[in-house]
């Protein structure tokens, strides 16, 4: 379950089953959300383009202690080929825009659903 960044990148990308599992997990998060997700933590917005998985992980990895997104962090880590640590930032972040984790998850989910519908997973 590794890739060289995002769907627009050359090389291996997550197969359809892995993408479907990530989508299902994000759906689960949005549907089961009661209190503010991750206590309303804010994360950097990202460009949903090439290198999306690593950029998403770089953003979400700065959220600690949020059990709701632990599995998502694990999955994104599996999709990103390089080591990502908290406090690490790439040019893929929209560095002047922070959004709530809940909104980040919704945006990511919408984008992944679109890619899945278009068959962009192999």
């Amino acid at each position: 379950l590794t890739c060289l960044g995002g769907f627009a990148s050359p090389g291996p990308v997550p197969p359809s089953t892995a993408l479907r599992e990530l989508i299902e997990e994000l759906v689960n998060i949005t549907q089961n959300q009661k209190a503010p997700l991750c206590n309303g933590s804010m994360v950097w917005s990202i460009n949903l383009t090439a290198g999306m998985y690593c950029a998403a992980l770089e953003s979400l990895i700065n959220v600690s202690g949020c059990s709701a997104i632990e599995k998502t962090q694990r999955m994104l880590s599996g999709f990103c080929p390089h080591k990502v640590s908290a406090g690490q930032f790439s040019s893929l972040h929209v560095r002047d825009t922070k959004i709530e984790v809940a909104q980040f998850v919704k945006d990511l989910l919408l984008h992944l659903k679109k890619l899945f519908r278009e068959g962009q997973f192999n």
């Epitope: 991750c38 206590n39 990895i61 202690g65 949020c66 059990s67 632990e70 694990r74 880590s77 908290a86």
Partner: antibody, heavy 118, light 111 residues
Framework: QVQLKESGPGLVAPSQSLSITCTVS????????INWVRQPPGKGLEWLGM???????DYNSVLKSRLSISKDSSKSQVFLKMNSLQADDTARYYC????????????WGQGTSVTVSS | NIVLTQSPASLAVSLGQRATIFCRAS??????????MHWYQQKSGQPPKLLIY???NLESGVPARFSGSGSRTDFTLTIDPVEADDAATFYC?????????FGGGTKLEIK
């Protein structure tokens, strides 16, 4: 800087309950997970349970019926309560904070020693 | 529950030599391409200290003499070369599944 400090009764009579407080500083409990780990004298480490920043609580299934973990984020305190103590519960009890993903236990308190004896 | 079995229970290594500690899990601790196995060092009278996370990543501030390897069920902690200050008990720990579990520990003595 990150600090954790456990405080407990020291001595507990058999069949009684144990209450330990972990008071933290240098970070917020709303965005951090706190674990409870114990270590009997001369023995290894045993994970008791944890409370996530968002409130979820996970317990060691073997001890779940005797354990209760809670917190008061506004006071920066995490609480461990254990019922029906016996001699083999004698141990040093640690609280430890997870780091960021992948949630290994990065920061530890010095621990508090608990002896179960009449 | 995932049971972690460490070997040997104790070992004595000469100063400057290599120490190798093993940890075997009763089932895989891998998830999405990562191994959720961590290593700690505990010196006498002190709390444990994280050395290695995700099987092979060195925690900040830990000397490069420490290294970790392995995947799925078999993991290794290596100290090379061993220094006098390394005398301690070392524990592996998994958090791939709840409950989190520790290995029984390996006591390292420096000769």
């Amino acid at each position: 800087q990150v600090q954790l400090k456990e405080s407990g009764p020291g001595l507990v009579a058999p069949s009684q309950s144990l209450s330990i407080t972990c008071t933290v500083s240098g970070f917020s409990l709303t965005g951090s997970s706190i674990n409870w780990v114990r270590q009997p004298p001369g023995k290894g480490l045993e994970w008791l349970g944890m409370i996530w920043g968002d409130g979820r609580i996970d317990y060691n299934s073997v001890l779940k019926s005797r354990l209760s973990i809670s917190k008061d984020s506004s006071k920066s305190q995490v609480f461990l309560k254990m019922n029906s103590l016996q001699a083999d519960d004698t141990a040093r009890y640690y609280c430890a904070r997870d780091g960021y993903y992948p949630y290994a236990m990065v920061y530890w308190g010095q621990g508090t020693s608990v002896t179960v004896s009449s | 529950n995932i049971v972690l079995t460490q070997s040997p229970a104790s070992l004595a290594v000469s100063l400057g030599q290599r120490a190798t500690i093993f940890c075997r899990a009763s089932e895989s601790v891998d998830s999405y391409g990562n191994s959720f196995m961590h290593w700690y060092q505990q010196k006498s009278g002190q709390p444990p200290k994280l050395l290695i996370y995700l099987a092979s990543n060195l925690e900040s501030g830990v000397p490069a003499r420490f290294s970790g390897s392995g995947s799925r069920t078999d993991f290794t902690l290596t100290i090379d070369p061993v220094e006098a200050d390394d005398a301690a008990t070392f524990y592996c720990q998994q958090n791939n599944e709840n409950p989190r579990t520790f290995g029984g520990g390996t006591k390292l003595e420096i000769k």
